[in-house]
């Protein structure tokens, strides 16, 4: 089809070489009701009215893809041909940055219900690079969390090196959706809930003599539970004295709590102290049994294939840690008088 | 550094099978459950299958029932999807997932699988 009456939008993705992160294009045709731009090929492409990502119920959010190759060739079917970007209803998502990704993007309706249809298209223009900027060397990450329950901000991490007074006007995504209150560099969210959670896109204009691009940015941003402040405590064994039977195998069980850390290292380990010695037994691997949003329960057994006098002198110890600290219970074994 | 590193993905006829495998580095345990994600284009991330790691239970999505199959080796830590008589509709990114603090927390790059003629 004829891309030269499609409205033009030039976008600019800036990448940071040290994280991992994706890139949204939204098909960007007006809101039927409040332009008459799909319907009449009326518009030059300068005379676009506001965008909003078409997310509405005339199923305009059923669109097709193209990318227009730069050697003239004709457009090439996204979904076919490039398997690191997904189309999710009307929105593009790059999963990883490259400059690769630098290129022309066309968006239509699938449906063309009329001649007048054929113009409503969009064609993104996009330039990816890597981000140069030394001076900005803590800038925002592009995945963000928040804190259930407390005051927390979602930073535009293309902007967030630049004071809020300094900040041009931003328009904010979340999930797609046009966030209309917000439009500085900055979201406060006064208390955070789970449905703070998701993909937000911050988009603002620079412009030179000759053009203006929209700068765009895209932040996961996850809800959390904050990272406990206990050390672990071990629900079993309880008791330090375990009565058992000569000649018979024993497992014993550890069972510990650990609370939520968001970089989660748990260790928990048997060790056996015999008079002065003491050293770590080789057991089966620890298993989370429970898992909850704010605790995960982690056993690990010992496991003697036959109790012997010896055991009896010896106590068998469990060992857990985490970041803030380690607890220990001992087992002394007890032979079972009959 | 907890990771997970999918392997196995690639093209296929339909009625063909692939077996993808989802290797653990960094765990200090097993978690309670691991899990097979896909995403196609265009469509939410689903789940395909998980395992328990307490008792070795299997859940699977309704469309792969009967032809997909989850399994892990704790001893190489390690977790596998058997995927036979395969159709055009599960051609996806794959993705495999680590339960942690009540959800699947720690996820894979993903691997391709791609069913054509």
């Known amino acids: 089809f004829n891309i030269s009456g499609c409205s033009t939008k030039k976008l600019l993705w800036t990448y940071s070489t040290r994280s991992e992160e994706e890139f949204v294009l939204f098909c960007d045709l007006p809101e039927p009701q409040k332009s008459h731009f799909c319907h009449r090929n009326r518009l030059s492409p300068k005379q676009v009215p506001e965008h909003l990502p078409f997310m509405g119920s005339n199923d305009l959010s059923d669109v097709q893809w193209y990318q227009q190759p730069s050697n003239g060739d004709p457009l090439e079917d996204i979904r076919k041909s490039y398997p690191h970007i997904i189309q999710d209803k009307c929105t593009l998502h790059f999963l990883t940055p490259g400059v690769n990704n630098s290129g022309s993007y066309i968006c239509r309706p699938k449906m063309i219900k009329s001649p007048y249809d054929v113009a409503c298209c969009v064609k993104m223009i996009l330039e990816v690079k890597p981000q140069t900027n030394a001076s900005c060397e803590y800038s925002a990450s592009h995945k963000q969390d928040l804190l259930l329950g407390s005051t927390g901000s979602i930073s535009c991490p293309s902007l967030s090196c630049q004071s809020d007074a300094q900040s041009p006007a931003v328009t904010w995504y979340k999930n797609g959706k046009l966030l209309s209150v917000e439009r500085s560099n900055r979201i406060v969210v006064d208390e955070v809930y789970d449905y703070h959670q998701g993909t937000y896109v911050c988009d603002y204009t620079q412009s030179d003599t000759v053009s203006s691009w929209t700068v765009r940015a895209v932040v996961q941003v996850r809800t959390i539970v904050g990272d406990t402040k206990l050390k672990p405590d071990i629900l079993d064994p309880v008791e330090d004295t375990l009565e058992v039977e000569l000649g018979k195998p024993l497992t014993i069980s550890c069972k510990a709590r650990f609370g939520f850390e968001r970089v989660f290292n748990p260790v928990i380990k048997w060790y056996i102290k015999d008079s002065d010695l003491e050293w770590e037994v080789s057991v089966p691997e620890a298993k989370s049994i429970k898992s909850t949003l704010k605790d995960e329960i982690i056993e690990r057994n010992i496991i003697l294939e036959k109790v012997t006098q010896r055991d009896l002198r010896r106590k068998f110890v469990c060992f857990v840690q985490n970041s803030i600290g380690n607890t220990t219970q001992s087992v002394q074994l007890k032979e079972k008088r009959g | 550094q907890v990771q997970l590193q999918e392997s196995g993905g690639g093209s296929v006829q339909p009625g063909g099978s692939l077996r993808l495998s989802c290797a653990a580095s960094g765990f200090t345990y097993i978690p309670a459950y691991m899990g097979w994600f896909r995403q196609a284009p265009g469509k939410e991330r689903e789940r395909v299958a998980s395992i328990s790691s307490t008792d070795g239970s299997t859940t699977y999505a309704d469309s792969v029932k009967g032809r997909f199959t989850v399994s892990q080796d704790t001893a190489k830590n390690t977790l596998y999807l058997q995927m036979n008589s395969l159709k055009p509709e599960d051609t996806a990114m794959y993705y495999c997932?680590?339960?942690?603090?009540?959800?699947?927390?720690?996820w894979g790059q993903g691997t391709q699988v791609t069913v054509s003629s």
């Open positions: 997932a680590a339960y942690q603090f009540g959800a699947f927390r720690v």
